[in-house]
């Protein structure tokens, strides 16, 4: 049952294909899993800074540090990817800056370009110097936790030396790792001391141990693989937009709704209205009017411009965005002041972003 009554015969989903709008693209910060990421909030004169991720308040925790205008993420994982915002609250206004964080694993990209440097990992020893296995490049083994998006390729390396040349075998969760243990098997490149798994799936999660041994000894190293599922998502709306506004009678005002969607978003601007003196229909649902929606006859749907406003235009304006996956909406209030009263500080009304959701 719909949660509102539509005043005019405006269909929620236009039958004509919407034009593909240029959806706002914020700055993108890229990090590899395990790395630390530091971002400075690029806003001036901030009395108080608050942070959000995908529209949800971000507080400090064991991996997230918030110091002044800096956000630090320690040991980033793909789950840290998303749309971030910092909002600077000042005495008279607030401003928000948005950026994307993309945590992807360069060595799990599916290509083996970095294998070109593998030759130096294959160390030849003087035949007289017998030696137990040892690691030749511990830097390549420092990152033990690998959080990788599903369908990517993963490579674990254990560059080693010894005399005679050690052999390498792999265990999964402490047991011998056999080809038949995963669909598509895996590759071992002995000359690069590497294990390669293509197109990882959630069942590949676990601990992978390389055991390097010769007749003089044995060493081992364990990696933990976490497979992060990637899937399409419903629209994400930039936090804090649309923003509350005020103007005088006869003035003009603009509401802006910034949308992030990897599928065609359908944008609607909706307002609560009265019909026959009532805000609610006989079913108890509010009357809503679609003022603008994305479609072939609509210019930039992310902006709702109101000209020559009257007192009747005051009220709540909802930016509602849908794609084939789901919906998101946020709202703002318009305060219309009498002509003799200049607009001062914006009227502080808390608008619920979940009103229609």
């Amino acid at each position: 049952r719909p949660s509102f009554s539509l005043v005019e015969d405006t269909t929620l989903e236009p039958e004509e294909p919407p034009t593909k709008y240029q959806i706002s693209q914020p700055e993108v910060y890229v990090a590899a899993p395990g790395e630390s990421l530091e971002v400075r909030c690029l806003l001036k004169d901030a009395a108080v800074i608050s942070w959000t991720k995908d529209g949800v308040h971000l507080g400090p925790n064991n991996r997230t540090v918030l110091i002044g205008e800096y956000l630090q993420i320690k040991g980033a994982t793909p789950r840290d990817s998303g749309l971030y915002a910092c909002t600077a609250s000042r005495t008279v206004d607030s401003e928000t800056w948005y950026f994307m964080v993309n945590v992807t694993d360069a060595i799990s990209s599916g290509d083996d370009e970095d294998d070109t440097d593998g030759a130096e990992d294959f160390v030849s020893e003087n035949s007289n110097n017998k030696r137990a296995p040892y690691w030749t490049n511990t830097e390549k083994m420092e990152k033990r936790l690998h959080a990788v998006p599903a369908a990517n390729t993963v490579k674990f390396r254990c560059p080693a030396g010894g005399n005679p040349m050690p052999t390498m075998r792999w265990l999964k969760n402490g047991k011998e790792f056999k080809q038949e243990h995963r669909i598509g098997g895996y590759k071992v490149r002995n000359q690069h001391w590497s294990l390669i798994m293509e197109s990882v799936v959630p069942s590949d999660k676990g601990n992978y141990t390389c055991v390097v041994e010769n007749e003089y000894g044995s060493i081992n190293h364990t990696y933990h693989l976490d497979v992060v599922e990637r899937s399409p998502h419903r629209p994400i709306l930039q936090a804090g937009l649309p923003a509350n506004a005020s103007t005088v009678v006869g003035g003009d005002v603009e509401f802006v709704c910034k949308v992030y969607s990897d599928a065609q978003p359908h944008i609607q601007w909706i307002k609560h209205v009265e019909k026959n003196g009532s805000k609610y229909g006989p079913d108890g649902l509010p009357y809503l009017k679609v003022l603008k929606h994305s479609g072939i006859n609509s210019s930039n749907a992310e902006v709702l411009a109101l000209f020559n406003v009257t007192e009747a235009d005051a009220g709540e304006y909802i930016c509602k965005v849908s794609n084939y996956i789901g919906q998101a909406n946020q709202s703002a209030w318009l305060t219309v002041l009498p002509k003799q009263q200049a607009p001062g500080r914006e009227k502080e009304i808390t608008a619920s972003p979940d009103y229609l959701e």
Epitope: P14, E16, P232, Q264, Y324, I325, G326, Q327, E357
Partner: antibody, heavy 114, light 107 residues
Framework: QVQLVQSGAEVKKPGSSVKVSCKAS????????VHWVRQAPGQGLEWIGS????????SYNQNYRGRATITADKSTSTAYMELSSLRSEDTAVYYC???????WGQGTLVTVSS | DIQMTQSPSSLSASVGDRVTITCRGS??????IAWYQQKPGKAPKLLIY???YRYSGVPSRFSGSGSGTDFTFTISSLQPEDIATYYC?????????FGQGTKLEIK
């Protein structure tokens, strides 16, 4: 894990109605559309419509507007698709799918026969 | 409504072959297309979304490309378990229409 479990097969008379249910689990039901898709025997896939359970917004394929009604019950995380004025050509497997089409129900065979 | 024209309607290939299926939209749909695999008696399975993104757990031999009106789905090296019917679907605007399907058989 995400699951969509549909009601069992139905045999209906022409002119009658059928209501197929789709119970969701393993995800936030109100955060995704639920789509309904049908497939006649030996034929391709056809989108019937969808609903956003959180607010009941629904959208329909014009071919089914007026005959199909899609509803959702948030309290039980269940979506429903009712098809009225059934005719023999409505004999098909009816599927529900989560908004991203990544998860589908097992399908419900509706046979319309006199 | 946006029509999705899929070709070929059927094709026969050998294990290890590279297989390509195309889909053309009657209107531009940017990259809003998905590809599904359906085996007899089973629900469709999402392989590719937004034209080129492989869904979680889908083997890397499956890929998609294209933008606007013309799209391609490729199996780089056909495996016996890939025998199925494949569908494209536009998810740009309602009604979300499917192509008529491509039935893939092993020679």
């Amino acid at each position: 894990q995400v699951q969509l479990v549909q009601s069992g097969a139905e045999v209906k008379k022409p002119g009658s109605s059928v209501k197929v249910s789709c119970k969701a689990s393993g995800y936030i039901f109100t955060s995704y559309n639920v789509h309904w898709v049908r497939q006649a025997p030996g034929q391709g896939l056809e989108w019937i419509g969808s609903i956003y359970p959180d607010n009941g917004d629904s959208s329909y394929n014009q071919n089914y507007r007026g005959r199909a009604t899609i509803t959702a019950d948030k309290s039980t995380s269940t979506a429903y698709m009712e098809l009225s004025s059934l005719r023999s050509e409505d004999t098909a497997v009816y599927y529900c799918a989560r908004g991203d089409f990544a998860y589908w129900g097992q399908g419900t065979l509706v046979t319309v026969s006199s | 409504d946006i029509q999705m024209t899929q070709s070929p309607s059927s094709l026969s290939a050998s294990v290890g072959d590279r297989v390509t299926i195309t889909c053309r939209g009657s209107n531009g749909i940017s990259n809003d297309i998905a590809w599904y695999q359906q085996k007899p008696g089973k629900a469709p399975k999402l392989l590719i979304y937004s034209a080129s993104y492989r869904y979680s757990g889908v083997p890397s031999r499956f890929s998609g490309s294209g933008s606007g009106t013309d799209f391609t789905f490729t199996i780089s090296s056909l495996q016996p378990e890939d025998i199925a019917t494949y569908y494209c679907q536009q998810h740009s605007t309602t009604p979300y229409t499917f192509g008529q399907g491509t039935k893939l058989e092993i020679k």
